[in-house]
Structure formats: structure tokens, C-alpha cells
């Protein structure tokens, strides 16, 4: 790795392209510039993504994969480096685009929302789960009354269109639902959404959208949940949710309401048992949540309450606080 | 219970074709994504195809990309792969097998006894 | 070269224990991915033995379990019998390649007679 003390010319790379490999998906591909001199030092190169959205970073191999949206078009440029002596060479850039697919702006779908939900799956045998997808979406405000929209997802290397749809009173696609997908509830990859349309009348602009999946995931309810009284003890249990993720990975919070007096005490916690010391006098009503913890998951959304579950008596006494 | 019988193996020449068929039974078919895995004489074993219940997804190893294509009939309940442009590195035992995603990393939890694949002049 | 590498061989006589161990990178099981194993008898096609990292199908015996840490996944095997003779591999799901489903290269075990 020797290199001569007379000044270094980098040159940029050559045969840089960009080739969609998949929904959201791109493949940037470049070669070393066959003029190079200096061949036997470790030459990189730094990405520079400037649209839809700006990033860079480096690498030492000619090509990278790249998940992003297309809907807006694509560009990106390349260039090689050297680190030298505390310094950092470059050349200048190569540059490629993708053009933004054609369509009015106002002939594609708005308000693109998608969440994820595990249900119970009669047919495996081993994992008892299935992960469902539920998307649904406004038609463009300048989309012709005779637009028809389509949607797919991509996650991982599966991609599937939607076979199961909801139509407005014109007919149109406004909503998907997929009982089963390929998306992997524990997994980290992007989910990605494209929703494309067509029309006799004008070209229909295609969206798409990513959806980290710990944003997206509707949890579902604790189960079995119990509570019983014993003197001034409210006893309160539950089982984790219908969920791929273990026990461990749950956190909960516990809603006991004083039918009485209107007191709401809402407790988090990480175990399946609270106990409260209560006034035995009164009526409650229990109702439990639950959430993938921080510990298996980034922060995600919390499930809809339990139903309410009723223990004590509703006698007039004297109030005493909790 | 599960089974998964292969059948259409044989010897081929370097750029011919042959058809792999699975005949499934003991389960409902039409609800499981299903896949080919193969492996060479003295290897390890290498995924090839995979296909979703419906049969309008398909995946593939980059070493068969453009050359394989698997398909399927659910009325028949029967799983195929299309060999083209075959090639000595394509000679393996071939496996039928379930391909079972759920909520995570596909997992292959039944398996045909295999049918061998034989790419030789 | 399989992207997830296992040792080619492991010996062990009857009653011990044996670990195979299944190293990967950050593309694959250092991403928290899923690892299974697979029983491979001789002349026989091979069956699932543990999913889910740790997770056993039913009829395959406690004497097998699995475990995962950072970019490694690892098969124990205790109280060793002649009939564990058999190839195992490992297998996960690579974010970096298309397909995505990688073995490992297997490791045959031999019960010492």
C-alpha cells in the first residue's frame, strides 16, 4: 500500500446506475474508474443520496442497496476517497437519477395509513400466530371518477398485491386487508406500501410510503383477565396478548376506576399481577393494556383497553380515601 | 398427517430442462406458502425457490434466478419447478418442503424424501 | 462459503454433551433473527428439530436444546445417543442477500463407539 509522494489524482467512478430491484427499492451500482493510477491503495467511496430525502455515508464495495420511496423520483451521487495522512482525498461526483413516475400530484391516494395485528393461525402447527395487514386510504382530490387503485407490500423479499379490498360508493379500491402476510412482527426491516392506479382518462400518479413496523403494530388486549377482592385487597391478574413476542416483553398498565367516588388510579407495571389496597366498600371496574417493552422492541403503541371487568359492592357508606 | 412426495428427477444434459412435481397431502394445501431446497452430493443443503398459498408470489436464490421458475396448482395440490438452462452445479437431491413464515423467519417444517437431479454429458 | 458458518465436525461419546455452535454477522442472527435446526439422519431428508431459536416440535426429545447470543446461535445436545448421528445445520434469514433464507455448511456428529 505504497504511496508515491507526488500529488494523488482520484478520478470519479464510472458506469454509475441506478436500477430498481424491488417496492422501494433501489440498487446502486458503479465501477472503479478504469484510469486510475494508483490501483494497489484502499480506495472508498462515499454515497450521497440527495432525493427524496438527503443522506450519505461510505463503503468500500461497488454497490448499495437503498430502501426508499419512489414516488418523488430518486438521485444520488458517488465519488472515491482516500484517507490520507489525517486528510481525505476525493474526486469529483458521478451522479444518475430516476424520474419521478408520471401523474398529476392530485391523482394519487392521500392519508395512506397501514397497521399490523397477530391473530390466531389454525394452520401452524408450531407458531400459533399469523400477522394481518389493514391499509386504507382517501382517493386524490384531482382523480378521475373512473380511478381504480391497487396496492402491494413489500416485506423483505416478498412482495404480494391486495386481494381482499373495501370500495367507496363509486366503486373505488379505499381500503386492503390481508389476513395473512409474509412481515415478521419481531423483525426489523421496513415494511413498504405502494399503492398505484389507472384510469381511462389520466396517467395516476403512484405513492408510496415506509412503515417502520413498531409504529404500525396494533397490539392486541391482555388476556383472561381476573380480579377479586379479599378484605381491602384487589387482586387483579392477566395473561400476556395473543402476540409472537415472549412474556417477558410486555409492559402493562392497569386502569381501576371507584364507581363510587370517580377515583381513577392507572398503575404500569411488567408483571401479569397487581394487587391494590382498596376501599371494599365500593364497586370497580378493572381494565388492563399492554405494550411491547423497550427492552424487545423500540417504543410502539399501546393496545386498546381490556374489557371492563366488575368486582365489589355498590353500598352507600361513609367514603374513606384510598 | 403431512406428506410431500417428489417426483421428475433424472439425468439431463448442461442446458437442458426437467420438471419437478410435489404431490402434497394430509393438510390444506392451498393455505401454506411452500418452497424447493436442494442439496449437492456430499453438501450442505441450499434454498431455491420459495412461493406464496396463492401462487402469485414467488422468490429465488440468486444462483437459479432467471433460469427456475416455481409454480403451483392448488386444485391439484401439487408444487412445481421448472428447470432450465441446467448446469453441473444444479446436480442435487431436490426437496419439497413448507414454508412457514407466520410472524418471523420461514421455517421448513415438513420435507419430502427428495428426487434427484443429475446435470451430466 | 455459507454465510452462516458451523463447524465441519464434532465427536462426543455416549451420555456427554456436545455443542455445535452457528456464527453469523449483524445482517443476520446480530439482527435478532429467528435461528432453526435440522436433524439430517443418514440417507434420510432432514427434519426440523429446534425453531425459534430454543423451541422444540413436538416428539423431538428435551435432550436437545437451542440458544442465540449476539451473532451466534448455538445446538446443545445432552446425554448423548447413538441414534444423534447425524448432520445439523443451522439456518436464519439474511437482510443483505435476495431470498433471504441461509444455511449453515452443517457439522456432522459422530458418536464414539
Known amino acids: 500500500d505504497l504511496l508515491p509522494d507526488d500529488k494523488i489524482s482520484l478520478l470519479p467512478p464510472v458506469n454509475f446506475t441506478i436500477k430498481v430491484t424491488g417496492l422501494a427499492q433501489v440498487l446502486l451500482r458503479w465501477e472503479p474508474n478504469p484510469d486510475q493510477e494508483q490501483r494497489n491503495v484502499n480506495l472508498e467511496y462515499q454515497v450521497k443520496i440527495n432525493a427524496p430525502k438527503e443522506d450519505d455515508y461510505e463503503t468500500r464495495i461497488t454497490e448499495s442497496k437503498c430502501v426508499t420511496i419512489l414516488h418523488k423520483g430518486f438521485s444520488a451521487s458517488v465519488r472515491t476517497i482516500l484517507q490520507k495522512d489525517h486528510s481525505l482525498l476525493a474526486s469529483s461526483w458521478a451522479s444518475a437519477e430516476l424520474h419521478a413516475p408520471p401523474g398529476s400530484p392530485g391523482t394519487s391516494v392521500v392519508n395512506l395509513t397501514c397497521t399490523t395485528n397477530t391473530t390466531a393461525d389454525n394452520y401452524s402447527y408450531l407458531r400459533p400466530y399469523q400477522v394481518s395487514l389493514h391499509c386504507t386510504w382517501l382517493v386524490g382530490t384531482d382523480a378521475p371518477e373512473d380511478t381504480q387503485y391497487f396496492l402491494y407490500y413489500r416485506y423483505g423479499s416478498w412482495t404480494e398485491e391486495c386481494q381482499e379490498y373495501s370500495k367507496d360508493s363509486m366503486g373505488r379500491n379505499i381500503a386492503c386487508w390481508f389476513p395473512r402476510t409474509f412481515i415478521h412482527s419481531r423483525g426489523r426491516d421496513w415494511l413498504a406500501v405502494l399503492v398505484n392506479g389507472s384510469s381511462k382518462h389520466s396517467a395516476i400518479k403512484p405513492f408510496d410510503q415506509l412503515f417502520a413496523l413498531h409504529a404500525i403494530d396494533q397490539i392486541n388486549p391482555p388476556l383472561n383477565v381476573t380480579a377479586e377482592i379479599k378484605g381491602t385487597r384487589l387482586s387483579i391478574q392477566w395473561e400476556k396478548p395473543v402476540s409472537a413476542f415472549p412474556i417477558h416483553c410486555f409492559d402493562y398498565e392497569v386502569k381501576i376506576h371507584n364507581a363510587r367516588n370517580g377515583y381513577l388510579q392507572i398503575e404500569k407495571m411488567m408483571t401479569n399481577a397487581f394487587i391494590s389496597i382498596i376501599d371494599d366498600l365500593s364497586k370497580y371496574d378493572v381494565q388492563v393494556r399492554a405494550a411491547v417493552s423497550s427492552m424487545c422492541r423500540e417504543a410502539g403503541l399501546w393496545s386498546e383497553w381490556s374489557q371492563p371487568i366488575y368486582v365489589g359492592k355498590d353500598e352507600h357508606k361513609p367514603l374513606r380515601q384510598w | 398427517q403431512v406428506q410431500l412426495q417428489e417426483s421428475g428427477g433424472g439425468l439431463v444434459q448442461p442446458g437442458g430442462s426437467l420438471r419437478l412435481s410435489c404431490a402434497a397431502s394430509?393438510?390444506?394445501?392451498?393455505?401454506?406458502?411452500m418452497s424447493w431446497v436442494r442439496q449437492a452430493p456430499g453438501k450442505g443443503l441450499e434454498w431455491v425457490s420459495a412461493?406464496?398459498?396463492?401462487?402469485?408470489?414467488?422468490n429465488y436464490a440468486d444462483s437459479v434466478k432467471g433460469r427456475f421458475t416455481i409454480s403451483r396448482d392448488n386444485a391439484k395440490n401439487t408444487l412445481y419447478l421448472q428447470m432450465n438452462s441446467l448446469r453441473a452445479e444444479d446436480t442435487a437431491v431436490y426437496y419439497c418442503?413448507?414454508?412457514?413464515?407466520?410472524?418471523?423467519?420461514?421455517?421448513?417444517?415438513?420435507w419430502g424424501q427428495g428426487t434427484m437431479v443429475t446435470v451430466s454429458s | 462459503q455459507s454465510v452462516l458458518t458451523q463447524p465441519p465436525s464434532v465427536s462426543a461419546a455416549p451420555g456427554q454433551r456436545v455443542t455445535i455452535s452457528c456464527s453469523g454477522s449483524?445482517?443476520?442472527?446480530?439482527?435478532?433473527?429467528?435461528v432453526h435446526w435440522y436433524q439430517q439422519l443418514p440417507g434420510t431428508a432432514p427434519k426440523l428439530l429446534i425453531y425459534d431459536d430454543n423451541n422444540r416440535p413436538s416428539g423431538v426429545p428435551d435432550r436437545f436444546s437451542g440458544s442465540k447470543s449476539g451473532t451466534s446461535a448455538s445446538l446443545a445436545i445432552t446425554g448423548l445417543q447413538a441414534e444423534d448421528e447425524a448432520d445439523y445445520y443451522c439456518q436464519s434469514y439474511d437482510s443483505s442477500l435476495s431470498g433471504h433464507v441461509v444455511f449453515g455448511g452443517g457439522t456432522k456428529l459422530t458418536v464414539l463407539r
Open positions: 418442503a413448507d414454508y412457514a413464515t407466520n410472524y418471523g423467519v420461514p421455517y421448513f417444517g415438513s
Open positions: 412461493i406464496n398459498s396463492g401462487g402469485k408470489s414467488t
Open positions: 394430509g393438510f390444506t394445501f392451498s393455505n401454506y406458502a
Open positions: 449483524r445482517s443476520n442472527i446480530g439482527s435478532g433473527y429467528d
